[in-house]
């Protein structure tokens, strides 16, 4: 291809790509009509004055994954048509003032994964058409007031994975067009009131993995268009009653991995689009009446790995759409017979790893569509007669790791289990704990010296789409029959390319190997 440097490949579509460790300077001559230039994985350490002078038609320039640590202020001179500039994954510590001067068409500027220590208002003052600014993965400790004041058209700003300890309430005030703001993985301890007031078009706000302890009551009151709010893995201990009241568009809210002790009734103000709510790994001790009553469309509610010991009978009022409820690994000893009565569409419930001693006979009375019930690792000695009889779709029931008392009172349950053996799965079966002479024997085949009629094992409905189960054998919920191991906190695995905390522990659902749904 005419005019293509030997170290590069050039396509007829005016695209030039230069890669390889042997490249130590910007190759020349570059084709005069190049519209896209990529310089990747080279040993270039600096950009001198005007290396791109003869390719003024350039629209996209990617200089990524190099050894680049120094740029001359005039490096990008004559690139007035440039719309996309990426300097990501280099070793830049300092940006020269005026570096982006003359880039009047620039819309996307990617400076992520460098070693930038600071930014100044003068850095971006010429970038009035900028729509996207990526600064994540640097060493920024603070953002000075005015840094973004000229970026009135900005729609996406990523400041994640820096070392920010505080944010000025004025720093975002002119970003009225901003749709995405990411501040995840910093060291923020609080967000001043008014910080987000100017962000009337904000759709996504990522604050996860900071050290935020308190949220101001009106922090999100101007963000009526917010759709995704990430607050997980902070130190939030309480939620002001009105904090989520003005978020009618919200469809994703993560609060797991905080220090929440209680949830006040109606705390989740009308959110007609919220379909999943993840509250696992907090310190919630009780659930009052109507705490979720505004979440009429909620389909999945995860409350596992808290310290819940009491659930008010009306706690789940309003959750008429709920399909999956996870309450495993809490401190529940008793449940009111009406607690699940409003959950007419519930399909999966996980109650394992609690301290349940008994269940009311009507506990599942109105939940006719239940397909999966997890009750393993509790303190159950028996279950009321007919507790599961009306659950025609039930195809997965886990009862192991309970101290079943195998006296004559167990016969109705034993007979039902015999009839419904396939529903129990094949991995682990319930065994007797008492009396001592039958301890360890299978509850299903135990001889209680009473004749048991011969049974026909019916065909069980096929497995439902059940909640998550661990797909490796190393999680506590897959342990053997004798195990009563408490679940530990998840091992966090934070990745570079994602903005959301990822955990490598599948046990927030805590389902067993057999639960493949």
């Amino acid at each position: 291809y005419h005019g293509c440097p030997s170290e590069c490949t050039c396509s007829r579509a005016s695209q030039v790509e230069c890669t390889g460790a042997r490249i130590v300077a910007v190759p020349t001559p570059l084709p005069w009509n190049a519209m896209s230039l990529q310089i990747l994985n080279t040993h270039i350490t600096e950009l001198n004055e005007s290396p791109f002078l003869n390719i003024s038609a350039l629209i996209a320039l990617r200089i990524e994954k190099n050894e680049l640590s120094r740029i001359t202020p005039g490096a990008f001179r004559n690139l007035g048509s440039l719309r996309y500039l990426s300097l990501a994954n280099n070793k830049l510590q300092v940006l020269p003032i005026g570096l982006f001067q003359g880039l009047d068409s620039l819309e996307s500027l990617l400076l992520s994964s460098n070693q930038l220590l600071q930014i100044q208002p003068a850095h971006f003052s010429q970038c009035s058409n900028l729509k996207e600014l990526q600064l994540h993965g640097n060493h920024l400790e603070y953002i000075p007031d005015g840094a973004f004041d000229h970026l009135v058209g900005l729609t996406k700003l990523n400041l994640g994975k820096n070392s920010l300890t505080h944010i000025s309430p004025r720093v975002f005030q002119h970003l009225g067009n901003l749709q995405v703001l990411r501040l995840y993985e910093n060291r923020l301890t609080d967000i001043p009131m008014g910080t987000f007031d100017g962000l009337v078009n904000l759709q996504e706000l990522a604050l996860q993995q900071n050290q935020i302890g308190l949220l101001s009551p009106g922090l999100f009151h101007n963000n009526h268009n917010l759709q995704r709010l990430y607050l997980s893995n902070n130190h939030i201990s309480q939620l002001p009653p009105s904090v989520f009241m003005q978020l009618p568009q919200l469809n994703r809210l993560t609060l797991f991995g905080n220090s929440l002790k209680e949830l006040s009734p109606g705390i989740f103000g009308p959110m007609p689009n919220l379909r999943e709510l993840w509250l696992y790994d907090n310190h919630i001790s009780s659930l009052p009446d109507n705490v979720f009553s505004n979440l009429r469309q909620l389909q999945v509610l995860i409350l596992s790995r808290n310290q819940i010991s009491f659930i008010s009978p009306g706690a789940f009022n309003g959750l008429t759409e709920l399909r999956e409820l996870s309450l495993h690994t809490n401190a529940l000893q008793d449940l009111d017979g009406n607690v699940f009565r409003m959950l007419a569409n519930l399909q999966n419930i996980s109650l394992q790893n609690n301290r349940l001693r008994q269940l009311p006979g009507n506990i599942f009375a109105n939940v006719n569509g239940l397909m999966a019930i997890q009750l393993q690792n509790n303190q159950l000695e028996n279950l009321p007669l007919g507790i599961f009889d009306h659950l025609g779709k039930l195809c997965e029931l886990r009862l192991y790791d309970n101290p079943w008392r195998c006296d004559s009172d167990i016969l109705p349950l034993r007979n039902w289990l015999l009839l419904n053996q396939p529903r129990l799965g094949t991995d682990t079966v319930p065994v007797c704990f008492s009396p001592a002479n039958v301890r360890g024997q299978s509850l299903i085949i135990i001889n209680v010296n009473v004749a048991v009629p011969s049974v026909h094992v019916p065909e069980v409905p096929s497995y439902p789409e059940t909640p998550w189960y661990p797909d490796t054998p190393s999680y506590p919920d897959t342990t053997s029959v004798s195990s009563t191991t408490e679940l530990t906190s998840p091992v966090e695995d934070y990745t570079d390319l994602t903005t959301i905390q990822v955990t490598d522990d599948r046990s927030v659902w805590g389902m067993t190997q057999a639960q493949s749904g």
Epitope: E321, E465, P467, W468, T495, T498, T499, G517
Partner: antibody, heavy 119, light 110 residues
Framework: EVQLVQSGAEVKKPGSSVKVSCKAS????????IHWVKQAPGQGLEWIGL????????NYNQKFKGKATLTVDTSTTTAYMEMSSLRSEDTAVYYC????????????WGQGTTVTVSS | DIVLTQSPDSLAVSLGERATINCRHS??????????MHWYQQKPGQPPKLLIK???SLESGVPDRFSGSGSGTDFTLTISSLQAEDVAVYYC????????FGGGTKVEIK
């Protein structure tokens, strides 16, 4: 622009395994469910299962349990489906698709990967 | 599993005319708020494309000549005025339980 780009066509011997990849871009990978769907030649669509990169959780259609294994690599924003003990009836186009919430429709699909099992 | 029966198997409609596809479920897939029922279009050599979610909600970017209706066990996809580019196979899907699809309806121009 939301994109799911799948790996190329594969021809495999009966009894072998195949691993199909699905590279996601243009959206926050860990914030969406990734489904896998099978379409045998001239046939309709069959749901295999889903994976949620957020927590690494999986759900399978019981029919494909033991046949398909779904995994993700969040560092490369890629989902994988491995099919083992291949037989001629596993010959199909396999699609990955994205869903916003667990019960939502699949709003973006990969272009499909043809797997042919033949001796 | 929930069985979805689509009818007809194929359909020939004149350009500009109405096309109606039905999908019947073996059990209800609706609550008071939602019907867990979605419609897709698939053209030869292409992946399926989402048209309608939750029975009646038009996916963004889909022409408004497509509409969905129904609840419980019976659902309908309607193309109000068939265009040449609408020639395709249409599938219904339920996400109430293990996801299943209908057998497909092939729409052609008469």
């Amino acid at each position: 622009e939301v994109q799911l780009v799948q790996s190329g066509a594969e021809v495999k011997k009966p009894g072998s395994s195949v691993k199909v990849s699905c590279k996601a871009s243009g959206f926050t990978f860990t914030d969406y469910y990734i489904h896998w769907v099978k379409q045998a030649p001239g046939q309709g669509l069959e749901w295999i299962g889903l994976v949620y990169p957020y927590i690494g959780g999986t759900n399978y259609n019981q029919k494909f349990k033991g046949k398909a294994t779904l995994t993700v690599d969040t560092s490369t924003t890629t989902a994988y489906m491995e099919m083992s003990s291949l037989r001629s009836e596993d010959t199909a186009v396999y699609y990955c698709a994205r869903g916003d919430n667990k019960y939502d429709a699949m709003d973006y699909w990969g272009q499909g990967t043809t797997v042919t099992v033949s001796s | 599993d929930i069985v979805l029966t689509q009818s007809p198997d194929s359909l020939a409609v004149s350009l500009g005319e109405r096309a109606t596809i039905n999908c019947r479920h073996s059990q209800s897939v609706s609550t008071s708020s939602y019907s867990y029922m979605h419609w897709y279009q698939q053209k030869p050599g292409q992946p399926p494309k989402l048209l309608i979610k939750y029975a009646s909600s038009l996916e963004s970017g889909v022409p408004d000549r497509f509409s969905g209706s129904g609840s419980g066990t019976d659902f309908t996809l309607t193309i109000s005025s068939l265009q040449a580019e609408d020639v395709a196979v249409y599938y219904c899907e339920q996400s109430w339980e293990i996801r299943t699809f209908g057998g497909g309806t092939k729409v052609e121009i008469k």
